[in-house]
Interface confidence: medium
């Protein structure tokens, strides 16, 4: 089946069953149902699962029997219309089951929450988690899908089915050996990081879906795998583009039946037509599903072509290109996007579609004056700033880095970002912070070549994080601007932030710097989160304090802790050096 | 969806004649400029001709120029080389691609193969 063609089914339950079979099939349910009932407990998840799990084999099995002609969406959403606890448990969004589909769908999809007031996962001990799997396989699996799909309610679900595949073969492989926590516990933090990460790319698909509409995601794309698959014909992309886009479309929208059925018929798509896409496939297309799909999506850049003549030819020295414009004008920028970014897969996805927009700006004013080639002949020169600004923020940022290390790093961009947005909860700013900070490790390392789409399109994914948890409340004016204008020129409206002189700055509140002796016992980074949340308190209360300043207070909080920590009597030491701490900042920044 | 199906290629001998034809749906065909690329086997694309969207400014690779003519007819939706003087260096597969690009298109090329 091609990805386009959807046959007349009787019942779209039943073939949705038979084309994913019985566990993919209640994997894919149960995610959905926790992505939309994010507070529900696991055993109602279950119960639910089993029951259209059942229901679907009725449909299998005679494809006219009561209720199997219905939509997906009907037999889903009428299923978890039937919680008995709704209105108590979810407030507002019980309001949803009395509209019709595809108003109910629309109003479980606006009420999925991006920070949902759940417990933190913590991981029991190896031994525990070891009887656990053992004892009941199949449900603890199910958990995990549970618990990920309930905090990260727009994660990838097909993709989340290869993370559990993984999550199992860690404990089928560690549960026997010899150290257990040594086997497994490095393979938990990779899935848990991979996971977050993944996670965290998927919700800007699907904000560039649901905010900016399909234009902009098949933008995103054209620009992305035209880089990665840059012997492939505008016409393979332009293909692949389509089908991806429906890919995604479904899964954001809780399609997740028909997104999985979908990708998987896309990877065959690929891998069957290899020689015309990429030579990099071949290993890919050797793995079984899941991992085929997931290697596909990561596959590296294959080589560009040779001998690839000037851009300038058929986009600016054509005496025909206002008529190609005008008389095809996605089509005619798909083409520019895709031959600019397969001649530069040095430059992000976000500064291609900068040069993208600034070149159709450009047509639309120059194809309507009295010389259009004229007006447009030095539209590549107004490419040159566009480009340098990334390239010359990377290379500061990188030496900062690289003369800070991650956590110093980490902290300076905590203070940077406090000023520009002081009114966003220190927890948001804390989380967001770490995370841009990470690009360095992350990207530092990279030659110049791969600098800036590793570094720019990994900040675009962070700063959607910001995007999204700010939208649920709403504070500042200056995010909501940079989130909502453009999705492309996000990080450069937040770069060009200048501290908030319209701020004012937060009542000192010696609670807030009031440590225990509970700190010492945390993980490293959850001291670290400890210090960093102080350090944006600090800067809320006193935003005009300088770096060395902000500086000397984190150092002697440092040492306040390293002290007490080492103390007979942490606690006593904790509540008399922390006075005199407090006092002593107060001092320092002049509060 | 885009396409691209290429024709007309066959046996001929040296110093003989070849049409090839590439019939293009599923996009506006007269904005864009196309191409005709050839392959040999084993080895990279190599870019033959190119023609703008109105077909008033065609453009050849040195070892093709004075041979072969590029045209196309935009009613019809179809691209076409005219191939005089063959060589036996000519015997490749051939394809269109839009544009300049001399990446493989999806579909089958023709093949050309010039011998006595």
């Known amino acids: 089946r091609g990805v386009f063609r959807r046959d007349a089914h009787k019942s779209e339950v039943a073939h949705r069953f038979k084309d994913l079979g019985e566990e993919n099939f209640k994997a894919l349910v149960l995610i959905a149902f926790a992505q939309y009932l994010q507070q529900c407990p696991f055993e109602d998840h279950v119960k639910l699962v089993n029951e259209v799990t059942e229901f679907a084999k009725t449909c299998v099995a005679d494809e006219s029997a009561e209720n199997c002609d219905k939509s997906l969406h009907t037999l889903f959403g009428d299923k978890l219309c039937t919680v008995a606890t709704l209105r108590e448990t979810y407030g507002e969004m019980a309001d949803c089951c009395a509209k019709q589909e595809p108003e109910r769908n629309e109003c479980f999809l606006q009420h999925k929450d991006d920070n949902p007031n759940l417990p933190r996962l913590v991981r029991p001990e190896v031994d525990v988690m070891c009887t656990a799997f053992h004892d009941n396989e199949e449900t603890f699996l199910k958990k995990y899908l549970y618990e990920i799909a309930r905090r990260h309610p727009y994660f990838y679900a097909p993709e989340l089915l290869f993370f559990a595949k993984r999550y199992k073969a860690a404990f089928t492989e560690c549960c026997q050996a010899a150290d257990k926590a040594a086997c497994l516990l490095p393979k938990l933090d990779e899935l848990r990081d991979e996971g977050k990460a993944s996670s965290a790319k998927q919700r800007l698909k699907c904000a560039s879906l649901q905010k900016f509409g399909e234009r902009a995601f098949k933008a995103w794309a054209v620009a992305r795998l035209s880089q990665r698959f840059p012997k492939a014909e505008f016409a393979e992309v332009s293909k692949l583009v389509t089908d991806l886009t429906k890919v995604h479309t479904e899964c954001c929208h809780g399609d997740l039946l028909e997104c999985a059925d979908d990708r998987a018929d896309l990877a065959k798509y690929i891998c069957e037509n290899q020689d015309s896409i990429s030579s990099k496939l071949k290993e890919c297309c050797e793995k079984p599903l899941l991992e085929k799909s997931h290697c596909i999506a990561e596959v590296e850049n294959d080589e560009m072509p040779a001998d690839l003549p000037s851009l300038a030819a058929d986009f600016v020295e054509s005496k025909d290109v206002c008529k190609n414009y005008a008389e095809a004008k996605d089509v005619f920028l798909g083409m520019f996007l895709y031959e600019y970014a397969r001649r530069h897969p040095d430059y992000s996805v976000v500064l291609l579609l900068r040069l993208a927009k600034t070149y159709e700006t450009t047509l639309e004013k120059c194809c309507a004056a009295a010389d259009p080639h004229e007006c447009y002949a030095k539209v590549f020169d107004e490419f040159k700033p566009l480009v340098e600004e990334p390239q010359n923020l990377i290379k500061q940022n990188c030496e900062l880095f690289e003369q800070l290390g991650e956590y110093k790093f980490q902290n300076a961009l905590l203070v940077r970002y406090t000023k520009k947005v002081p009114q966003v909860s220190t927890p948001t700013l804390v989380e967001v912070s770490r995370n841009l900070g990470k690009v360095g490790s992350k990207c530092c390392k990279h030659p110049e070549a791969k600098r800036m789409p590793c570094a720019e399109d990994y900040l675009s994914v962070v700063l959607n994080q910001l995007c999204v948890l700010h939208e649920k409340t709403p504070v500042s004016d200056r995010v909501t601007k940079c989130c909502t204008e453009s999705l492309v020129n996000r990080r450069p409206c937040f770069s060009a932030l200048e501290v908030d002189e319209t701020y004012v700055p937060k009542e000192f509140n010696a609670e807030t710097f009031t440590f225990h002796a509970d700190i010492c016992t945390l993980s490293e980074k959850e001291r670290q989160i400890k210090k960093q949340t102080a350090l944006v308190e600090l800067v809320k209360h006193k935003p005009k304090a300088t770096k060395e300043q902000l500086k000397a207070v984190m150092d002697d909080f440092a040492a306040f802790v390293e002290k007490c920590c080492k103390a007979d009597d942490k606690e006593t030491c904790f509540a008399e050096e922390g006075k005199k701490l407090v006092a002593a900042s107060q001092a320092a920044l002049g509060l | 969806a885009v396409q691209l199906v290429d024709s007309g290629g066959g046996l001929v001998q040296p110093g003989g004649s070849l049409r090839l034809s590439c019939a293009a749906s599923?996009?506006?065909?007269?904005?864009?400029?196309m191409s005709w690329v050839r392959q040999y086997p084993g080895k990279e694309p190599e870019w033959v001709s190119s023609?703008?969207?109105?077909?008033?400014?065609?453009r050849y690779a040195d070892s093709v120029k004075g041979r072969f003519s590029i045209s196309r007819d935009n009613a019809k939706n179809t691209l076409y080389l005219q191939m005089n003087s063959l060589k036996p260096e000519d015997t490749a597969e051939y394809y269109c691609?839009?544009?300049?690009?001399?990446?493989?298109?999806r579909t089958q090329g023709t093949q050309v193969t010039v011998s006595s």
């Open positions: 599923g996009f506006s065909f007269g904005s864009f400029g």
């Open positions: 691609t839009i544009g300049r690009s001399v990446s493989r298109s």
């Open positions: 023609i703008n969207g109105r077909g008033d400014d065609t």
